[in-house]
Interface confidence: low
């Protein structure tokens, strides 16, 4: 799997999970989240050569097409596969609220 | 939806469905498929600005991050959403076989 265990241990130009820390206030302009101040969101990036973690038949076809027709703009893209939620604390007035924001953290990637 | 009905009728730089015809023999080097000779595979391409058909909370966060930090390499990518199968005819010896290849045709796109 193109996850932290593999990607953070290997120097990989191809599609892989990349570390990314997001500070809510500085990076997103969100001042409503009290805790945490930021989180390890991660992101997916890298090339998708033929058969590199292809997600579907179409992405396999597309990467093969791209190999044979390298001048073409049609090629698969490295995107998130498994995502996890993030628990946040915010306030409505003086009342603390805890909420789970779904699909906030990328855990692994794929070529799609 | 970022499908043919919308994308093929509008000139759209942002993430959208793009037409792509693939000739099995010429474009993929596949000689084993007898019919069809090729098919409209389509593909997804285009920019993913903030909130343009974002797939997940993470892709929304990433596109906002990318807007505020334009020098960053972290940004969502335009990929396939709905896919359809393709029915093909091929031969094993002289015996014709009909098979459905899953996820061969892209019908719509998303930013992920």
């Amino acid at each position: 799997a193109l996850d932290a265990a593999y990607c953070f241990r290997n120097v990989q130009d191809n599609c892989c999970l990349r570390p990314l820390y997001i500070d809510f206030k500085r990076d997103l302009g969100w001042k409503w989240i009290h805790e945490p101040k930021g989180y390890n969101a991660n992101f997916c990036a890298g090339a998708c050569p033929y058969l590199w973690s292809s997600d579907t038949q179409h992405s396999r076809v597309l990467s093969l097409y791209n190999t044979i027709n390298p001048e073409a703009s049609a090629s698969p893209c490295c995107v998130s596969q498994d995502l996890e939620p993030l628990t946040i604390l915010y306030y409505i007035g003086k009342t603390p609220k805890i909420e789970q924001l779904s699909n906030m953290i990328v855990k692994s990637c794929k070529c799609s | 939806a970022l499908d043919a009905a919308y994308c093929f009728r509008n000139v759209q730089d942002n993430c959208c469905l793009r037409p792509l015809y693939i000739d099995f023999k010429r474009d993929l080097g596949w000689k084993w498929i007898h019919e069809p000779k090729g098919y409209n595979a389509n593909f997804c391409a285009g920019a993913c600005p903030y909130l343009w058909s974002s797939d997940t909370q993470h892709s929304r966060v990433l596109s906002l991050y990318n807007t505020i930090n334009p020098e960053a390499s972290a940004s969502p990518c335009c990929v396939s959403q709905d896919l359809e199968p393709l029915t093909i005819l091929y031969y094993i010896g002289k015996t014709p076989k009909i098979e459905q290849l899953s996820n061969m045709i892209v019908k719509s796109c998303k930013c992920s």
Partner: antibody, heavy 120, light 106 residues
């Protein structure tokens, strides 16, 4: 993809209550962080923020109009309703609803606006 | 409440001109400042958020700067479609719009 549309009476009498509905598509108010706000603009004058409602039912109102305003949402119908009591001719304005994403405070998508005239 | 003061209230300019509009907050609002463009009979359109971030789809001739109490919207080379009214908006505490700046053809 994101659309908002305001609806309500074009004419109301002084002292009456105005009820405006914002019907939207392309997003959901059940999504964490999503909000809808109301803004008005008297003819030839500046924009004035009125009220806000968020996915979690958090509401905020303009200080000067707080006693006259009520905002509510119907998530299943993709609608936000604003009521304004004790209407006066000075409340004649174009009323807009707009989407606010993640408490960012800025409105990235707006309705086309509905003109409300207060007159007897 | 925080007051937002825009200047000038109107200006005349020609196509190709560099145009600068300022917005001053009555107290520190950090970078919680947005800019909108409005054409007659139309809804406002978001140009800049967070004082300097360009909204997607907005031409790069528009730029924003400032922090604290003083902010600027700059149009580097005025185009025919830029003749409109521009509003600043603070979102640090509640919401307040400026009174607007009308950009007219000279």
């Amino acid at each position: 993809q994101v659309t908002l549309r305001e609806s309500g009476p074009a004419l109301v009498k002084p002292t009456q209550t105005l009820t405006l509905t914002c019907t939207f598509s392309g997003f959901s108010l059940s999504t964490s962080g999503m909000g809808v706000g109301w803004i008005r603009q008297p003819p030839g004058k500046a924009l004035e923020w009125l009220a806000h409602i968020y996915w979690n039912d958090d509401k905020s109102y303009s200080t000067s109009l707080k006693t006259r305003l009520t905002i509510s949402k119907d998530t299943s119908k993709n609608q936000v309703v604003l009521t304004m009591t004790n209407m006066d001719p000075v409340d004649t304005a174009t009323y807009y609803c707009a989407r606010d994403f993640y408490y960012s405070g800025y409105f990235d998508s707006w309705g086309q606006g509905t003109l409300v005239t207060v007159s007897s | 409440d925080i007051q937002m003061t825009q200047s000038p209230s109107s200006l005349s300019a020609s196509v190709g001109d560099r145009v600068t509009i300022t917005c001053r907050a009555s107290q520190d609002i950090s970078n919680y400042l947005n800019w909108y463009q409005q054409k007659p009979g139309k809804a406002p359109k978001l140009l800049i958020f967070g004082a300097s971030s360009l909204q997607s789809g907005v031409p790069s001739r528009f730029s924003g700067s400032g922090s604290g109490t003083d902010f600027t919207l700059t149009i580097s080379s005025l185009q025919p479609e830029d003749f409109a009214t521009y509003y600043c908006q603070q979102t640090n505490t509640m919401n307040t719009f400026g009174q607007g700046t009308k950009v007219e053809i000279k």
